[in-house]
Amino acid sequence: MAVTACQGLGFVVSLIGIAGIIAATCMDQWSTQDLYNNPVTAVFNYQGLWRSCVRESSGFTECRGYFTLLGLPAMLQAVRALMIVGIVLGAIGLLVSIFALKCIRIGSMEDSAKANMTLTSGIMFIVSGLCAIAGVSVFANMLVTNFWMSTANMYTGMGGMVQTVQTRYTFGAALFVGWVAGGLTLIGGVMMCIACRGLAPEETNYKAVSYHASGHSVAYKPGGFKASTGFGSNTKNKKIYDGGARTEDEVQSYPSKHDYV
C-alpha cells in the first residue's frame, strides 16, 4: 500500500512540477524592470524567454517576439534549451509513469516491468527538474551580473545636464515558478525511484519444507546461502503475503511542499 501511495504521490507531484516548468517557460516575466531608481515611471518593462513586453499605466501592453535566433545571447539560448529539454523529458517521464502506476492494469504487465518503468520515469523527472532548476539559475545569474553592471554606470549624460536612466532588470515571477516547479519535479522523481524499490519483485519466499532422507533428518531451506551471505533477498523482517514480500518497516516519509510567497 505504501509503495502505491508513494508512486501515486510521486506521479502527482511530478505532474504539478512539469506543469509549472511549462508555465514558467511560457511566462513573459522572467525579468522585470527594477523600479527602485525610477518608481514614478508610467511605463513598465518585462521580458521572457520568447518575447519582451511593455505595459503602460493605462494597462496598454505591447509585446514583441525575439524574431532573431542568431542575434540572441548564447546564455538565453542555453536557458531555452534547458527548459525545453526539461519539458520533453518530463513529458516522456509522465507518459512512462502512467503505464507504470500500480493502480493501473495494462494487460498482463509484470511487476518487474512496472518497476523498471517507474525507475525510468523517476530518473527522467529528476533530470527534468535539474534542467529546469539549472535553466532558471543560469538566467538568474545573468540578471544579477547585468544588474550590477548597469548599476555601475547608472547615469550617463552630457555635462551632467541630461540624465539617461538605464533600465535595470530584476527577478521576475517566472524564476520563482521555475525554481519551485523544478524542485517539485525533482522530489516527484525521487519518490518514483523510492517506489521502484518496493515494486521490484523479490525472490519467491517458500515456507520451509522438510525432506526426510534415509538415515538422518535435514531441514532444507531454499535460498539459505543467499540469505546468510547477504546477497539476493534478505528475508529478515519480512511478512509473507500471497502477493509477494513487503518489508514491515517500509514507511515512506514525504517531503513537505513549500510554496513560494
Epitope: 515611471t41 511593455v54 493605462s58
Partner: antibody, heavy 118, light 113 residues
Framework: QVQLKESGPGLVAPSQSLSITCTVS????????VHWVRQPPGKGLEWLGV???????NYNSALMSRLSISKDNSKSQVFLKMNSLQTYDTAMYYC????????????WGQGTSVTVSS | DIVMTQSPSSLTVTAGEKVTMNCRSI????????????LSWYQQKPGQPPKLLIY???TRESGVPDRFTGSGSGTDFTLTIRSVLDEDLAVYYC?????????FGSGTKLEMK
C-alpha cells in the same frame, strides 16, 4: 461619440476646497483612465493627476497633499477635490481621457473656469 | 520632475511656410523596452481645449493632417508643420508621458505675419 463635461462651482473663497465633476459619455471608465489638467489665465498647461481604469491614482507631486481624484464607474463620473485653495489656483480645469497607448490625452472636455477670490 | 523646455516661445510665419519647433527634456523619454519615446504634442487654439496631434514622439493621431510631423529621440524632439495654414495658428505644447508627473512644456505660440 466620446464626450467629457466638467462642472464646477466657478467661484471659490481662499482656503476653501474645490470639487469638480467630470461626466463622461461614449466610453466606459472601466476601460479608460481620466486625467485632470489645469491652465491659469494666459499661462501654460499643468498636469494635476490621473485616475486609471482600475482605480489607481497618480498625482502631481507638488499638489499631492491637497489633491484627491476619485470616480463612480456606474455614473460615469470622475471627481477632483482640491483643498486649501489660494488665488494662484485660479485656472481653467480640464478633464481628458487617456488614449490607451502612449499615455496621451486624446479627448478633452471644454473645461470649467475656477476663480479663487474673496 | 522632468522639466520640458520649448523653443522658440513664439514664431511668426507666413502661410505656406515650413515651421519647426523644438522640445527638450532633462531626462531621456526613450523606453528601452519598446524603443518608443514617450512624448506627445498638443495644439491649443484660443478659447478651446488642447487637441492631441502626436504621441510616441512621431505617431500621428487619427484625423490629424499629414503636414504635422513629429521627430526626435531621447531628449530632443521636433514638431514640423510642412506647409502652415491659417488654421494652424495656435499654441503648441509638448508633454512628457514617460514619468510622473506628466509635465508640459511652456508652449510655442504660432502667429501669422
Amino acid at each position: 461619440q466620446v464626450q467629457l463635461k466638467e462642472s464646477g462651482p466657478g467661484l471659490v473663497a481662499p482656503s476653501q476646497s474645490l470639487s469638480i465633476t467630470c461626466t463622461v459619455s461614449g466610453f466606459s471608465l472601466i476601460s479608460y483612465g481620466v486625467h485632470w489638467v489645469r491652465q491659469p489665465p494666459g499661462k501654460g498647461l499643468e498636469w494635476l493627476g490621473v485616475i486609471w481604469a482600475g482605480g489607481r491614482t497618480n498625482y502631481n507631486s507638488a499638489l499631492m497633499s491637497r489633491l484627491s481624484i476619485s470616480k463612480d464607474n456606474s455614473k460615469s463620473q470622475v471627481f477632483l477635490k482640491m483643498n486649501s485653495l489660494q488665488t494662484y489656483d485660479t485656472a481653467m480645469y480640464y478633464c481628458a481621457r487617456d488614449r490607451y497607448g502612449g499615455n496621451s490625452l486624446d479627448y478633452w472636455g471644454q473645461g470649467t473656469s475656477v476663480t479663487v477670490s474673496s | 520632475d522632468i522639466v520640458m523646455t520649448q523653443s522658440p516661445s513664439s514664431l511668426t510665419v507666413t502661410a505656406g511656410e515650413k515651421v519647426t519647433m523644438n522640445c527638450r527634456s532633462i531626462q531621456s523619454l526613450l523606453n528601452s523596452g519598446n524603443q518608443k519615446n514617450y512624448l506627445s504634442w498638443y495644439q491649443q487654439k484660443p478659447g478651446q481645449p488642447p487637441k492631441l496631434l502626436i504621441y510616441w514622439a512621431s505617431t500621428r493621431e487619427s484625423g490629424v493632417p499629414d503636414r504635422f510631423t513629429g521627430s526626435g529621440s531621447g531628449t530632443d524632439f521636433t514638431l514640423t508643420i510642412r506647409s502652415v495654414l491659417d488654421e494652424d495658428l495656435a499654441v503648441y505644447y509638448c508633454q512628457n508621458s514617460y514619468s510622473y508627473p506628466f509635465t508640459f512644456g511652456s508652449g510655442t505660440k504660432l502667429e501669422m505675419k
